[in-house]
Amino acid sequence: TPLGPASSLPQSFLLKCLEQVRKIQGDGAALQEKLVSECATYKLCHPEELVLLGHSLGIPWAPLSSCPSQALQLAGCLSQLHSGLFLYQGLLQALEGISPELGPTLDTLQLDVADFATTIWQQMEELGMAPALQPTQGAMPAFASAFQRRAGGVLVASHLQSFLEVSYRVLRHLAQP
């Protein structure tokens, strides 16, 4: 059912989410920056090639179709946010060992995403919307080479930022009095 006023979501939860999204965005931007600086070396910058590579590597997108501000379905939207964060935890895990320079940034990003997923889960539990079972991890892309892992890193970081932009817009809309 579409959400009327967002009265069922506490302001403290929404503000916490906005803060966490911005932390992930900041740390994700740091990762992207480092990846882009490797772009020239590894020829990773061409958008068309990246899209094709994304298809061939099977890097999935996380949908937020239940979250449009005009007809937002609260249970569905929170569930999609949580599932999306769960997906990105797996994708970031698949990037492990991408490069020693990127390791610390990737590690921090992974924990940030886990924190945000925890926040969403807590709220779903409080609203009685938490599923009985946690989502299970689908097949993650297997990166066969250092090049694929780096290219995968560019794509995952880019997908994650797009997901966060939509999340941020939804949460900001809900946080408006």
Epitope: E19, R22, K23, F86, P104, D107, D115, T118, T119, Q122
Partner: antibody, heavy 118, light 112 residues
């Protein structure tokens, strides 16, 4: 209420391995990361690493990478830490701690005391 | 790694008076999202640590409002307005800006 119950004190020989446990109750285990912290007698707290039980992801402080192995059993809501190649430097109290969504450790186990002695 | 620095002991305090404990980090803990990722924990004798303050200035649930915390990106102060006997223990600051998570060496609050 949330509780983290840690296994009892351990006495081990140098070179041996030990595996300690942290049983979580009073909350859904998988959505929360579980962290481990070391405290040597009269000394500060050192973060060892954490496990994310939902995806079985582990991350370690570089200092403990070759020392600690973190695992979790979702069916029993229990986190484990194995310490290998023990030396007297590993004698300490080890705490498990649940990470809350503000990035803080909101619940702590009572600690497991490890004594390494020949 | 971010290094958190604390004095080992506070100035001995009298019950009912105020106390201050300081902490310094070698890197700013202020993130671009406006949050300062600094935390305070208290470890009472023979107990596990307990959370007092999160994100520099927020009081954890159940913590009396005698406790407060402030600071810049790198210099932080925990204040106890009216010290009680139960406040005795070791106070640790910690950072959660980036991995590895790090703690200060702890400051022992002592009574006169």
């Amino acid at each position: 209420q949330v509780q983290l119950q840690q296994s009892g004190a351990e006495l081990a020989r140098p070179g041996a391995s030990v595996k300690m446990s942290c049983k979580a109750s009073g909350y859904t285990f998988t959505p929360y990361t579980m962290h481990w912290v070391k405290q040597r007698p009269g000394q500060d707290l050192e973060w060892i690493g954490y496990i994310n039980p939902s995806i079985n992801y582990t991350n370690y402080n570089q200092k403990f990478k070759d020392k600690a192995t973190l695992t979790a059993d979702k069916s029993s809501s229990t986190a484990y830490m194995q310490l290998s190649s023990l030396t007297s430097e590993d004698s300490a109290v080890y705490f498990c701690a649940r990470r809350g969504s503000y990035g803080n450790f909101d619940y702590w186990g009572q600690g497991t005391t490890l004594t390494v002695s020949s | 790694d971010i290094v958190m620095t604390q004095a080992a002991f506070s100035n001995p305090v009298t019950l009912g008076t105020s106390a201050s404990i300081s902490c310094r980090s070698n890197k700013s803990l202020l993130h671009s999202n406006g949050i300062t990722y600094l935390y305070w924990y208290l470890q009472k004798p023979g107990q596990s640590p307990q959370l007092l303050i999160y994100q520099m200035s927020n009081l954890a649930s159940g913590v009396p409002d005698r406790f407060s915390s402030s600071g810049s990106g790198t210099d932080f102060t925990l204040r106890i307005s009216r010290v009680e006997a139960e406040d005795v223990g070791v106070y640790y600051c910690a950072q959660n800006l980036e991995l590895p998570l790090t703690f200060g060496a702890g400051t022992k609050l002592e009574l006169k």
